[in-house]
């Protein structure tokens, strides 16, 4: 098909982060077209010669795909017609980090938008009471982080207190020699209090909470990506 008009179409991306070894999504939406056959999606990465992915005439066109992405990319083919050009990236690698461009051609015109994709490792921490310790101790563990994060303890009762003197954090390299297991121990824990173990790097922030009372132990954890913004 040909583009006869002089219009540019709106393309929108969202910065995101990929967890090494897992699947990731590079988000991109555009003004939809009526005919799927009139839509071309091209994903590019700065510094890479070949295409990351190309979708045209209703199917993948991978003849110009760069070898570093071979077998690792897919668009949501059934959602292209409604303006979803997002890319699924399988088995995210550290080297996938960088600037990507989502380039769209339709019968209405063309448009493109860039997105920054960060890669690293992040996981939920779990906080437990360490019954093997000589004193009341909490142990915070998270299996996979990269780059090396910071670990900070906080407590509901002693708000603003600095626990660095009564805690010890270690980082153990995992078998794939990139990510690390995070272990932090908090000593001199008092009962009837809620403690938080906060793990953070430039990609994600995760918190593990534990509430210790005479009768029960309650745990809660959550993880937030730091760079997801439009």
């Amino acid at each position: 098909f040909g583009i006869s008009g002089r219009h540019s179409i709106t393309v929108t991306t969202v910065a995101s982060a990929g967890n090494i070894g897992e699947d990731g999504i590079l988000s991109c939406t555009f003004e939809p077209d009526i005919k799927l056959s009139d839509i071309v999606i091209q994903w590019l990465k700065e510094g890479v010669l070949g295409l990351v992915h190309e979708f045209k005439e209703g199917k993948d066109e991978l003849s110009e795909q760069d070898e570093m992405f071979r077998g690792r990319t897919a668009v949501f083919a059934d959602q292209v017609i409604v303006g979803n050009a997002s890319l699924r990236l399988k088995n995210v690698q550290l080297t996938d980090a960088g600037t990507y461009k989502c380039y769209i051609i339709t019968s209405k015109g063309k448009g493109n938008a860039n997105l920054e994709y960060k890669t690293g490792a992040f996981s939920m921490p779990e906080v437990n009471v360490d019954y093997n310790a000589s004193s009341e101790t909490l142990r915070c563990e998270a299996p996979r982080w990269f780059p090396q994060p910071t670990v900070v303890w906080a407590s509901q009762v002693d708000q603003g207190a600095n626990f660095s003197e009564v805690s010890n954090t270690s980082f153990e390299l995992n078998s794939e020699n990139v990510t690390m297991k995070v272990v932090s121990v908090l000593y001199n824990v008092t009962i009837n209090n809620t403690y938080s173990c906060m793990i953070e790097n430039d990609i994600a922030k995760a918190t593990g909470d534990i509430k210790v009372t005479e009768s029960e132990i309650k745990r809660r954890s959550h993880l937030q990506l730091l760079n997801s913004k439009a």
């Epitope: 540019s8 590019l44 700065e46 890479v48 010669l49 760069d66 070898e67 063309k110």
Partner: antibody, heavy 117, light 105 residues
């Protein structure tokens, strides 16, 4: 300031070899693909070769394929063009240029290669 | 292989508008870039992605691209705009147009 400075040009006999260098500064060199572009005397621009940021992938114009090799040393922020089996028609000013998506946003000042017996 | 055709020369009076065309099969579906080259100097990017301007390039330079023709428009032409202009697309390599010499009368 982003800068590209070519060197290594000169006069060489047909069939001989020459290696051009391009020193890059002012940007994260390893994250950008790079190009060599040439311009014969009184002629237009002709793309020669491109290399990915990591150096793992390269493309060549048909006119130089099998004779020229593009490479890079990211630890030295330097781009190279090894030119073998040189011909008279390879006489040109050779520019290195930083690739930006589908185009080139920064160019060096060029280095002159003359192939003559 | 993909070919881009430009007129060899375009002449324009100072203060007027110059239009330089770049023809290619369905070029409207490609991203077109324009370079200015003055004698003895390296090319300079003046328009990228059809119509965007790099920082430092005057607003007088604009571009459009549709169908089989991309156009570089220079409004209020100045003597300093006299140069060779090249269009360029990517097609498994950089493809340059034949070049247009802009003469300011």
């Amino acid at each position: 300031e982003v800068q590209l400075v070519e060197s290594g040009g000169g006069v060489v006999q047909p069939g001989r070899s020459l290696r051009l260098s391009c020193a890059a500064s002012g940007f994260t060199y390893s994250s950008r693909a790079m190009n060599w572009v040439r311009q014969a005397p009184g002629k237009g621009l002709e793309w020669v070769s491109a290399i990915s940021g990591s150096g793992s992938n390269a493309y060549y114009a048909d006119s130089v394929k099998g004779r020229f090799t593009i490479s890079r040393d990211n630890s030295k922020n330097t781009l190279y063009l090894q030119m073998n089996s040189l011909r008279a028609e390879d006489t040109a000013v050779y520019y290195c240029a930083r690739k930006r998506w589908y185009g080139m946003d920064v160019w060096g000042q060029g280095t002159t290669v003359t192939v003559s017996s | 292989s993909y070919e881009l055709t430009q007129p060899p020369s375009v002449s324009v009076a100072p203060g007027k508008t110059a239009r330089i065309t770049c023809g290619g099969n369905n070029i409207g579906s490609k991203s077109v870039h324009w370079y200015q080259q003055k004698p003895g100097q390296a090319p300079v990017l003046v328009v990228y992605d059809d119509s965007d301007r790099p920082s430092g390039i005057p607003e007088r330079f604009s571009g459009s691209n549709s169908g089989n023709t991309a156009t570089l428009t220079i409004s209020r032409v100045e003597a300093g705009d006299e140069a060779d202009y090249y269009c360029q697309v990517w097609d498994r390599g950089m493809i340059f147009g034949t070049g247009t010499k802009l003469t300011v009368l």
